[in-house]
């Protein structure tokens, strides 16, 4: 194929791949008709003048995962057709000025996972056709004004995983075509008003894992096309009332891992397209009426691991499309009988790890499609007669780790559980806590006659019997509807997958496999 170096493999499709620790310089001669060249996992430490001079048809060049620490300014001379250049995962600390000069066709430039200490306006001033610039995983401490001024066609810019402590409000002002801006995992403490005003086409803004304490009220007011906004794992203690007001296209908002104590009235809206709202790991103590009422399309609401002790009966007004509601690991002792009445499409609810002593008999009255209810680790001693009767789709019910009182009042519940045992799962069954002579015995098989009789015995000692139908889908514990082995954060659709972490923490947020990626 017009000469293929021995250290490389060359395919008919003009693709050349050179890999291996024995390679210490760019192999020669490279086939003149090469259109794609990959130099991966080598011991190349520097690129000298014009090593690619004879392969001017090259469209894609990947020099990744090498020991590369120095590049001569003319290294990419004569590559006028190059559209894709990746220098990711090397050891570059400095980029020579003029390095990308002459790369008039360049659309994607990947400089991620190096040790770059700074960038200058002159670095990218020739890259007027650039659409994607990846700078994440470097050591950048600031971005000078003008750094991106010539990149008017840029649609994706990743500055995540650097050491940025502040951003100038002018640095992005000319990026009117930008669709994705990632600033996650930096050290930003605040973002000046106007920083994102020029980004009228922005669809994704990733600001998670910084140290942001305050958001300017009008910070996102010009970003009408924003669809995904990631603000998780910051230090945000309050949200200005109008901060999310101009975001009609938003469909995912993550605010978990902040210091929010309350949700100001009208804060979420109008957001007619929001599908997911992640608020776990905050300090929220109560939910007033109508706090989510503008979120008519919301399907996933995660409020776990807060300090919620009171939910107003109209807190979930408007959430007619909600499928998943996570309230576990809070301080709930009481629930008003009307609190879930509006959630007609709810499928999964997690209420585990609270202090619930009893449930209203009609708590699930309007929620006929419930498939999974997590009630483990509360203070429940009994449940009202018929509380689950109308829930024909219920296939997962967790009741263990409650102090069940196994007197004769428990008979109706015991009889229903006996008929619906598969719904309880096989891992842990509910056991009696009192009276003392039956403590630790399974609630399902307990002989209630042995227990101390209650003051009054129900006349009809059984729940109306909803049998377990074998054709109802049953979920083994490892892939259950509310599997507790999940991601600590929602999947953020990153091509570079820099922030996704899997955990085995059994107390994260009680959601479906589908939602946990």
């Amino acid at each position: 194929y017009h000469g293929c170096p021995s250290e490389c493999t060359c395919s008919r499709a003009s693709q050349v791949e050179c890999t291996g620790a024995r390679i210490v310089a760019v192999p020669t001669p490279l086939p003149w008709n090469a259109m794609s060249l990959q130099i991966l996992n080598t011991h190349i430490t520097e690129l000298n003048e014009s090593p690619f001079l004879n392969i001017s048809a090259l469209i894609a060049l990947r020099i990744e995962k090498n020991e590369l620490s120095r590049i001569t300014p003319g290294a990419f001379r004569n590559l006028g057709s190059l559209r894709y250049l990746s220098l990711a995962n090397n050891k570059l600390q400095v980029l020579p000025i003029g390095l990308f000069q002459g790369l008039d066709s360049l659309e994607s430039l990947l400089l991620s996972s190096n040790q770059l200490l700074q960038i200058q306006p002159a670095h990218f001033s020739q890259c007027s056709n650039l659409k994607e610039l990846q700078l994440h995983g470097n050591h950048l401490e600031y971005i000078p004004d003008g750094a991106f001024d010539h990149l008017v066609g840029l649609t994706k810019l990743n500055l995540g995983k650097n050491s940025l402590t502040h951003i100038s409000p002018r640095v992005f002002q000319h990026l009117g075509n930008l669709q994705v801006l990632r600033l996650y995992e930096n050290r930003l403490t605040d973002i000046p008003m106007g920083t994102f005003d020029g980004l009228v086409n922005l669809q994704e803004l990733a600001l998670q894992q910084n140290q942001i304490g305050l958001l300017s009220p009008g910070l996102f007011h010009n970003n009408h096309n924003l669809q995904r906004l990631y603000l998780s794992n910051n230090h945000i203690s309050q949200l200005p009332p109008s901060v999310f007001m101009q975001l009609p296209q938003l469909n995912r908002l993550t605010l978990f891992g902040n210091s929010l104590k309350e949700l100001s009235p009208g804060i979420f809206g109008p957001m007619p397209n929001l599908r997911e709202l992640w608020l776990y790991d905050n300090h929220i103590s109560s939910l007033p009426d109508n706090v989510f009422s503008n979120l008519r399309q919301l399907q996933v609401l995660i409020l776990s691991r807060n300090q919620i002790s009171f939910i107003s009966p109209g807190a979930f007004n408007g959430l007619t499309e909600l499928r998943e509601l996570s309230l576990h690991t809070n301080a709930l002792q009481d629930l008003d009988g009307n609190v879930f009445r509006m959630l007609a499409n709810l499928q999964n609810i997690s209420l585990q790890n609270n202090r619930l002593r009893q449930l209203p008999g009609n708590i699930f009255a309007n929620v006929n499609g419930l498939m999974a209810i997590q009630l483990q680790n509360n203070q429940l001693e009994n449940l009202p007669l018929g509380i689950f009767d109308h829930l024909g789709k219920l296939c997962e019910l967790r009741l263990y780790d409650n102090p069940w009182r196994c007197d004769s009042d428990i008979l109706p519940l015991r009889n229903w559980l006996l008929l619906n045992q598969p719904r309880l799962g096989t891992d842990t069954v509910p056991v009696c806590f009192s009276p003392a002579n039956v403590r630790g015995q399974s609630l399902i098989i307990i002989n209630v006659n042995v227990a101390v009789p209650s003051v009054h015995v129900p006349e009809v000692p059984s729940y109306p019997e909803t049998p377990w139908y074998p054709d109802t889908p049953s979920y083994p514990d490892t892939t259950s509807v509310s599997s507790t082995t999940e991601l600590t954060s929602p999947v953020e659709d990153y091509t570079d997958l820099t922030t996704i972490q899997v955990t085995d923490d059994r107390s994260v947020w009680g959601m479906t496999q589908a939602q946990s990626g």
């Epitope: 009332p241 309350e262 100001s264 009235p265 009208g266 109560s286 007033p288 009426d289 109508n290 706090v291 009422s293 107003s312 009966p313 109209g314 007004n317 002792q333 009481d334 008003d336 009988g337 009307n338 009445r341 509006m342 002593r357 009893q358 209203p360 008999g361 009609n362 708590i363 009202p384």
Partner: antibody, heavy 118, light 107 residues
């Protein structure tokens, strides 16, 4: 239908206590919060606090902490409010009220007039 | 505490007229405002909740509007039975608070 029936008027001496009742019917008493509201002549309405009958948990307006005590008797579906160390400022009509589908007062008792006078 | 101010203590109107009762909150309460009607010697009756939603059985001549801090109860085509005192209430944060009331008089 939901009904809240309050006890009759009370005439009490300054420094004494009074306990007024609110009997609920037409719904499951333990499943819904009961609120208490004070109305002094010509002085509008003041929220005193709520109690959740199923657990006995309470929340008070700071202004009434130590003055009002909310309790329930679930066996008779009755909520009680005790007012202590009465002064003329406590002369008012007291209402019990229940929320509906939000934290506004959909159902009201007829009110109990408390007059503090020597 | 959030202060709910009903600036007009009394309003005078005639049968068939349109009248607007206003209420101002000292801080943002979203739409968590209710309006009550209280006739002499009776308990209050909820007319409007969530700022603009009519309670069941309330005639459609009663309408509510507003959000944030400014709220209005409008009675169009006033009837003689509308002679009463009208209170606004915020239920966004504890302690829940009421306005001082506006008495509607029919000329």
């Amino acid at each position: 239908q939901v009904q809240l029936q309050q006890s009759g008027p009370e005439l009490v001496r300054p420094g004494a206590s009074v306990k007024i009742s609110c009997k609920a019917s037409g719904y499951t008493f333990t499943d819904y919060y009961i609120n208490w509201v004070k109305q002094r002549p010509g002085q509008g309405l003041e929220w005193i606090g709520w109690i959740y009958p199923g657990s006995g948990n309470t929340k008070y307006n700071e202004k009434f902490k130590g003055k009002a005590t909310l309790t329930v008797d679930t066996s008779s579906s009755t909520a009680y409010m005790q007012f202590s160390s009465l002064t003329s400022e406590d002369s008012a009509v007291y209402f019990c009220a229940r929320w509906g589908y939000g934290a506004y007062f959909t159902y009201w008792g007829q009110g109990t007039l408390v007059t503090v006078s020597s | 505490d959030i202060v709910m101010t009903q600036s007009q203590k009394f309003m005078s109107t005639s049968v068939g007229d349109r009248v607007s009762v206003t209420c101002k909150a000292s801080q943002n309460v979203g739409i968590n405002v209710a309006w009550y009607q209280q006739k002499p010697g009776q308990s209050p009756k909820a007319l409007i909740y969530s700022a603009s939603y009519r309670s069941s059985g309330v005639p459609d001549r009663f309408t509510g509007s507003g959000s944030g801090t400014d709220f209005t109860l409008t009675i169009s085509n006033v009837q003689s039975e509308d002679l009463a005192e009208y209170f606004c209430q915020q239920y966004n944060s504890f302690p829940y608070t009421f306005g001082g009331g506006t008495k509607l008089e029919i000329k």
